[in-house]
Interface confidence: low
């Protein structure tokens, strides 16, 4: 079959497949004359074998991991035997199949990791080899855990990268190891070739022993430390620890203190730095945060509890300079007069703020001294000898001792004499009638005015008359106000009207005083009034649930992701559609029927955070009534901005020629959030053949200097590529260009003919 | 599980353009970072370039840089490599790879589902 297995000697590559006993021929040469016979030579290993008349084959089965290819020769001879043709290469190419097993390069791993590792993170590679073609499955390896020990729930706290061996905790490990329960594991690990997808893969095992070493890096127990400490500061309080030696140590104070009373050293002992006040603040709470040498942080921050203790610093104070009370003429005994209640700043339900009362002086002492009583603990003042006359004394001066353990004040109260309260409020009128309101009246509306009338002293608690609302608004959405001037009662709406809960409410006031009547004398049905307040219905638009909703996501959720959700009702139990307004970067939609709202577009925290847009809740039918509510969508950073120079570095010069190296400083910024720590950029030169000019070295985390290598520069414009790397998750790496010139210097500044002038640098270094 | 199925691979000559396709099937796209990579015979395979969850983030290796651009769109469930100025030495089986890893746009080199492949030939 001329062309597939004959033909004439030309340079030929063939494929066989090794293993393979010979069962055709490769290729049959045919000659040109004056060729006669053919003679061949190379990488033969006595397998590859040409007849005289041309007829290539091989004798035996091929070995890929021997020679994977056979260069060959093929020359044509005369019949002299000298070469007329060739010789021309002849390739065979030996193809793979799988007769090699996967091996482990150990029969036996020792690890170990520290719990609340990073999920995902390894800790451990595996790695096994296979002789076979790693370009085809038969070298293609998958690695697998068969069995994890011991197994707690069955759930696997360890994972491995089927490809690269790579062994991590899974999200369960890195919250629940621990070392004090279960101090060591063993995996055991096979290898699969055919990349773990055949039944005919070969395999091995190894065994992984890893230990689990304790996370020394935690939140130590809350503090608590008495206040106005006279020891000498600063004084040791606690401490954390990083679980290796070197680590940097911070504190950070999120409520920005004015006077923040805490200090870390490089031990990672806490220290208080002056004497506290509890009354000014019982509890801190604040950060310790440990980080490496470039200042990134090591882990999570720590949060450090400080609790206050009291101790009795203040003295007892009363409620004003004199407190006034009114007691009627012929009360009887035992009577209260009324509770002074004196205060402490001392921490509540403690000793250093539990009171003591104690009568004094009593003035005038008239008809006698001891008058009064003060319940020694609760501060109420009694009638304690007899009734009082207003025409023999309308007015009594206490001075009341209160104490606390350590201290004593010294209060005043006022103690006046009034008429007896033997008459009731009577209503000028019993029934005031209906009166119909819509739902929607207004908040602080005066909707009714009721009058009753005392015969008592004026301008006492006897003819004060006090209304209250005793049936009918179980809801609190009434209430009346009094003029002290005239008793006069204002029937205002304290809480929205609402016809779906209450159409008809049967009110009914009582007029009283604040003085209790004298014996004898009752509330009688003259100090009672009636009215009914029908409610009419007004269509009113849904309600949100809230005034604004939160939601907090990673600027890099999934498009689709939901963000959050928002509720609202309609009174009248319309079903509701919701939709946005202001969503001015057409990030979010929302679900018309639930409220849930998703994103629609890749969503930016350097946009701008939180993102703000508003929501609209509709009735569906009705008059299509509506109401907003705003939903605010935090936006968490991820590192998705390539560092940049920090300003415009065009205009940078040197004077030609240079007399000794030079260096020029630039600053590189980025946009994405740096919480606990500044950016820590790291700066390298753009290419390898800018390395014999230039050099480039770290100043700090934002600034870095360009310095000459030489003084041999050409009078030109130099454009120097820097690559700076934010060393975030993930690294993001920018490639700046620095424009630097040098040129001929007149009094330090570039000079250029005339004709010259565009682009003249305007800095020289 | 999810598969990946890498297709837009041919011949092309020196300076032209290809663009690759992996479509993502059995679960979301936007559950995982995507990368594409290279083997040229006789060679190892090659990181070219990855995209974040989102498309936020793209990383490219040195050699590509500027000539491949690597893109997705979510809800067709599928990822892009548009490669310009094609070379010689660009020639290689292309791999479409997916990270599982719960990260967002956090990179390990913990590829863990890949495609089958598709030949890319640059010769004149």
């Known amino acids: 079959q001329e062309g597939k297995f004959s033909g004439p000697l030309k340079p030929m590559t063939f494929s066989i497949y090794e293993g393979q006993e010979p069962s055709q021929i490769i290729f049959q040469f045919k000659a040109n004359p004056p060729a006669v016979t053919f003679e061949l030579t190379g990488e033969t290993d006595n397998i590859f074998v040409i007849e005289r008349e041309g007829l290539l084959y091989y004798n035996r089965a091929l070995d890929r991991e021997t020679r994977s290819t056979h260069n060959l020769q093929v020359a044509a001879l005369d019949a002299n035997g000298i070469i007329v043709e060739g010789p021309v290469p002849i390739t065979i190419k030996v193809k793979d199949i799988n007769d090699n097993r996967p091996t482990f390069l150990q029969s036996k791993y020792e690890g170990s990791v520290r719990q609340n590792s990073r999920p995902g993170k390894p800790f451990l590679y595996v790695n096994a080899t296979d002789l076979d073609d790693p370009a085809t499955p038969n070298g293609q390896l998958y690695y697998q855990i068969v069995i994890q020990l011991p197994m707690i729930n069955n759930v696997m706290y360890f994972q491995i990268n089927n490809k690269t061996g790579a062994i991590s905790l899974t999200r369960e490990g890195s919250q629940e190891l621990n070392p004090a329960k279960n101090p060591s594991y063993n995996l055991v690990i096979s290898v699969k070739d055919m990349g773990g997808q055949s039944e005919n893969s070969f395999s091995d095992t190894t065994s992984v022993d890893i230990i689990v070493t304790e996370n020394i890096w935690k939140a130590p127990k809350p503090v608590e430390m008495v206040e106005n400490s006279t020891d000498p500061h600063p004084i040791k309080i606690t401490q954390v620890r990083w679980n290796d030696p070197g680590a940097q140590y911070s504190l950070v104070d999120k409520e920005k203190l004015p006077r923040f009373p805490f200090s870390i050293d490089q031990e990672g002992d806490i220290y208080v730095t002056q004497p506290l006040d509890r009354e000014e603040k019982d509890a801190y709470v604040f950060y310790a945060v440990a980080k490496d040498e470039y200042g990134k942080p090591l882990s999570y921050p720590l949060e450090i509890h400080v609790k206050v203790k009291d101790i009795n610093d203040n003295p007892p104070t009363c409620p004003s300079p004199v407190t006034v009370f009114e007691v009627q003429e012929n009360e009887r005994l035992g009577n209260s007069i009324g509770t002074l209640t004196a205060h402490d700043r001392d921490e509540e339900n403690t000793a250093n703020s539990f009171l003591n009362y104690r009568i004094v002086e009593q003035t005038p002492k008239l008809p006698m001294d001891g008058l009064f009583l003060i319940q020694t603990y609760a501060g109420m003042l009694q009638l304690a000898k007899q009734s009082l006359k207003k025409q023999d004394t309308p007015q009594y001066n206490l001075t009341i001792e209160v104490s606390d353990k350590d201290f004593k004040t010294l209060c005043f109260v006022q103690i006046n004499v009034i008429d007896i309260n033997d008459q009731i409020p009577i209503f000028e009128k019993s029934d005031y009638g209906n009166l119909t309101l819509a739902e929607d009246t207004n908040i602080g509306s005066t909707i009714l005015t009721i009058q009753a009338t005392d015969a008592d002293e004026p301008f006492t608690g006897s003819s004060k008359i006090l209304y209250h609302i005793i049936k009918g608004d179980s809801e609190g959405r009434l209430g009346v106000d009094t003029d002290p001037h005239t008793n006069t009662g204002y029937v205002i709406i304290k809480k929205p009207l609402d016809f779906e809960t209450a159409a008809v409410s049967n009110i009914v006031f009582k007029a009283e005083n604040p003085e209790p009547l004298v014996f004898g004398v009752k509330y009688n049905a003259s100090s009672f009034a009636k009215f009914t307040l029908i409610v009419t219905d007004v269509n009113e638009a849904p309600q949100f649930s809230q005034h604004v909703f939160q939601a907090k996501v990673s600027e890099d959720v999934a498009i689709g992701t939901k963000v959050g959700n928002v509720t609202a009702k309609d009174p009248e139990g319309l079903d509701i559609s919701y939709s946005l307004r202001g969503d001015t970067r057409g990030w979010l939609k929302i679900d018309h029927v639930t409220g849930e709202i998703f994103s629609v577009a890749p969503l930016d925290r350097e946009a701008g955070s939180p993102y703000r847009v508003q929501v609209v809740a509709t009735e569906v039918g009705g008059s299509s009534l509506s109401s907003v509510s705003e939903f605010h969508l935090i936006l968490m950073d991820v590192n998705d901005n390539p560092p940049r120079l920090a300003k415009d570095y065009t205009g940078l010069f040197f004077c030609h020629p240079l007399s000794a190296p030079g260096s020029l400083i630039f600053e590189a910024t980025d946009d994405d959030q740096h919480l606990f720590r500044g950016p820590h950029f790291t700066f390298s030169l753009g290419s390898g053949s800018l390395q014999n000019d230039w050099e480039v070295s770290k100043i700090n985390g934002t600034h870095a200097r360009l310095s000459t290598r030489h003084t041999e520069f050409e009078e030109r414009e130099y454009v120097v590529l820097i690559r700076i790397n934010d060393g975030g998750r993930p690294p993001l790496e920018g490639i700046v260009s620095l424009p630097v010139t040098f040129c001929s210097c007149v009094e330090g500044s570039c000079f250029r003919p005339a004709g010259h002038q565009t682009g003249i640098p305007t800095v020289g270094m | 599980e999810v598969q990946l199925l890498e297709s837009g691979g041919g011949l092309v000559q020196p300076g032209g353009s290809l663009r690759l396709s992996c479509a993502v099937s059995g679960r979301t796209a936007s559950e995982y970072g995507m990368g594409w990579f290279r083997q040229a015979p006789g060679k190892e395979r090659e990181f070219v370039a990855r995209?974040?969850?989102?498309?936020?983030?793209?990383r490219y290796a040195d050699s590509v840089k500027g000539r491949f651009t690597i893109s997705r769109d979510n809800a067709k469930n599928t990822v892009y490599l548009q490669m310009n100025s094609l070379r010689p030495e660009d020639t290689a089986v292309y791999y479409c790879a997916a990270d599982g890893l719960p990260y967002g746009d956090w990179f390990g080199d913990q590829f863990d589902v890949w495609g089958q492949g598709t030949q890319v030939t640059v010769s004149s």
């Open positions: 995209i974040s969850t989102s498309g936020g983030v793209t």
